[in-house]
């Protein structure tokens, strides 16, 4: 986990200024509104798991 | 370090009543998704219940075997949750544990605490 | 519910070797980019411990000796090579829809 300003987070990964850290972008799925989400792969969403 | 703390469990006659608890530390405790899993050799593990966060207006959710019977709760100011547990039986027997998951995978858990339904 | 179906129960590996557990789910936890699915390691007197998340992607702290594979139905935990300390039992989980589900478990010994 970087701090934003050096290296970038992981493949697969962005980060979060909630929760200063970097997120799984896997999680977006889930919790589509999550601040870090707009750094994720722009793919199309999966259908929200309720 | 992230820590999650256990409290309750122990004894309880069949149709009685225990109140899990579980403190937290180390995290952004109100952003994650908080979960209870049992442990027990019949069953092996099995989650019970989820509570979100305000962001997603606190939803709850329950394993079909419980609903009705255990509510999760949580205390964001306090960094603290909670499962009440009613109506007991002897297949609730086992080891509990609370869990954090940000959305998919349990990420940190609690130590763990016995939990003997039994006359 | 997605049942998970683990094997073997149980394995001996000798130290070195190559321990390899499967995961198989009742249905797809898939998507065209990623699997919701999870690996933990649990010894004795412990909770589960955090291994492999979204199918392949290991947790920061794990040895590199753990790697994961698979996607769809069926999933696979590698370990290699196997040390004593690796001793413990192994379990899958999905996270595609509530409610969450664990795989039985696989016991590894090691010889």
């Known amino acids: 986990e970087q701090a934003p300003g050096t290296a970038p987070c992981s493949r697969g990964s962005s980060w979060s200024a909630d929760l200063d850290k970097c997120m799984d972008c896997a999680s977006c799925r889930a919790r589509p509104h999550a601040d870090f989400c707009l750094g994720c792969a722009a793919a199309p969403p999966a259908p929200f798991r309720l | 370090q992230v820590q999650l703390q256990q409290s309750g469990g122990g004894l309880v006659q069949p149709g009685g009543s225990m109140k899990l608890s579980c403190i937290a530390s180390?995290?952004?405790?109100?952003?994650?998704?908080m979960s209870w899993v049992r442990q027990s050799p019949e069953k092996g593990l099995e989650w019970v219940a989820e509570?979100?966060?305000?962001?997603?207006?606190?939803?709850?959710h329950y394993a079909e075997s419980v609903k009705g019977k255990f509510t999760i709760s949580r205390d964001d100011s306090k960094s603290r949750f909670f499962l009440q547990m009613n109506n007991l039986r002897a297949e609730d027997t086992g080891i509990y544990y609370c869990?954090?998951?940000?959305?998919?995978?349990?990420?940190?858990w609690g130590q763990g605490t016995d939990l003997t339904v039994s006359s | 519910d997605i049942v998970m179906t683990q094997t073997p129960a149980s394995l001996a590996v000798s130290l070195g070797q190559r321990a390899t557990i499967s995961c198989r789910a009742s249905?797809?936890?898939?998507?065209?980019?990623?699997?919701?699915m999870h690996w933990y390691q649990q010894k004795p007197g412990q909770p589960p411990k955090l291994l492999i998340k979204?199918?392949?992607s290991l947790e920061s702290g794990v040895p590199a000796r753990f790697s994961g594979s698979g996607s769809g139905t069926d999933f696979t935990l590698n370990i290699h090579p196997v040390e004593e300390d690796d001793t413990a039992t192994y379990y899958c989980?999905?996270?595609?829809?509530?409610?969450?589900?664990f795989g039985g478990g696989t016991k590894l010994e090691i010889k």
């Open positions: 869990s954090s998951t940000y959305a998919d995978y349990f990420h940190y």
């Open positions: 180390g995290f952004t405790f109100s952003s994650y998704w």
């Open positions: 509570i979100r966060s305000k962001s997603d207006n606190y939803a709850t």
């Open positions: 249905q797809s936890v898939s998507t065209s980019t990623y699997s919701y």
């Open positions: 979204y199918a392949s």
């Open positions: 989980q999905h996270s595609w829809e509530i409610p969450y589900t």
